[in-house]
């Protein structure tokens, strides 16, 4: 049976924690109901006990949404691209970045043309 | 940051539905959570329901599921509540508020709602 | 739905004085839990976000602890600009609610 609070005071006794960033609450089963949180406050970190309401319509799976631009040019120094994507929905209580920026590495093909560029460039 | 603006007062003859609204300046008003909330005077703050304006998902207080009426207009970034056959019991300070649980929230000055014949 | 019990009501204090504001959730609701103050005539301000998350632009005095179901409100040396009423609000579940208020007054 899970306790209410499992706290691990990774600070040491008497160590003030003035501000936790606590993460989304992540249901024990299925995709509603009771499960926990983590929380972190510098070295410390602690586990909650918590609900999420199954009267919330799931009608999006992941806490954050975004609207995605599309995918710019490949970098042929570090072999990736990247996109923007701003926050289209969240869940009422998930703090999600407004913006995020997410790489992937190039295809093969890409990387090829982006590399066929540079040398040209140096001539 | 977010501004909401309300009109200051409204004026409504009973059983006359009345339609609300808070426009939003600045930044991304089609990203959060509008939430209406009422307040009779003196007295404590009563949630109404919110709406996503990215998709119009709605989410209602079943207290007021025959008297509000949300939506919103994403072309000129304004949230609407319409209230159907007002009494005098529905005259109250409604607030708007755009809630994000990153950054908080803002909110709207507040429309005082008085319904009177 | 989830009750809000506030208390005390009404606080009479003395500018410099701190003091704590109580919440008591009818059940749990993790850290699901905001602080608002509202002056007359004002709308609601929010003060502490998710039990004890500080709010940009509020003055460090004031700050919030708690999970399940207590919650505390903390003003460190009141000021005469933080008189009103403070409202706490749950957003575990639907419908979101609001607590009654305590009323912090001049003593």
């Known amino acids: 049976v899970a306790k209410k609070k499992d706290k691990v005071k990774k600070g040491g006794p008497g160590s003030e924690c003035a501000e936790w960033a606590w993460g989304p609450c992540t249901p024990s089963s299925k995709d509603c109901g009771v499960g926990f949180r983590e929380g972190t406050c510098g070295a410390q970190t602690q586990r909650i006990r918590c609900r999420v309401p199954c009267n919330w319509k799931k009608e999006f799976g992941a806490d954050c949404k975004y609207k995605f631009e599309n995918w710019g040019a490949c970098d042929g120094g570090t072999g990736t691209k990247v996109r923007q994507g701003t926050l289209k929905k969240a869940r009422y209580n998930a703090q999600c970045q407004e913006t995020i920026r997410v790489t992937k590495p190039c295809t093969p093909k890409t990387k090829a043309k982006a590399k066929a560029k540079k040398g040209k460039g140096k001539d | 940051q977010v501004q909401l603006q309300q009109p200051g007062a409204e004026l409504v003859r009973p059983g006359h539905s009345v339609k609300l609204s808070c426009k939003a300046s600045?930044?991304?008003?089609?990203?959060?959570?509008m939430n209406w909330v009422r307040q009779r005077p003196g007295q404590g703050l009563e949630w109404i329901g919110m709406i996503h304006p990215s998709d119009s998902e709605t989410i209602l207080n079943q207290k007021f599921k025959d008297k509000a009426t949300l939506t919103v207009d994403i072309s000129s970034n304004t949230a609407y509540m319409q209230l159907s056959s007002p009494t005098s019991e529905d005259s109250a300070v409604y607030f708007c508020s755009s809630w994000s649980a990153k950054r908080g929230d803002f909110w709207g000055q507040g429309t005082t709602l008085t319904v009177s014949s | 739905d989830i009750v809000l019990t506030q208390s005390p009501a009404t606080l009479s204090v003395t500018p410099g004085d701190s003091v704590n504001l109580s919440c008591r959730a009818s059940?749990?609701?993790?850290?699901?839990l905001h602080w608002y103050q509202q002056k007359s005539h004002e709308s609601p301000r929010l003060l502490i976000k998710y039990a004890s998350q500080s709010i940009s632009g509020i003055p460090s005095r004031f700050s919030g602890s708690g999970s399940g179901t207590d919650f505390n409100l903390s003003v460190n040396s009141v000021e005469t600009e933080d008189f009103g009423m403070y409202f706490c609000q749950q957003s575990n579940s639907w419908p979101l609610t609001f607590g009654a208020g305590t009323k912090l007054e001049l003593k």
């Open positions: 059940e749990s609701i993790s850290n699901n």
């Open positions: 600045g930044q991304s008003f089609s990203s959060y959570w």
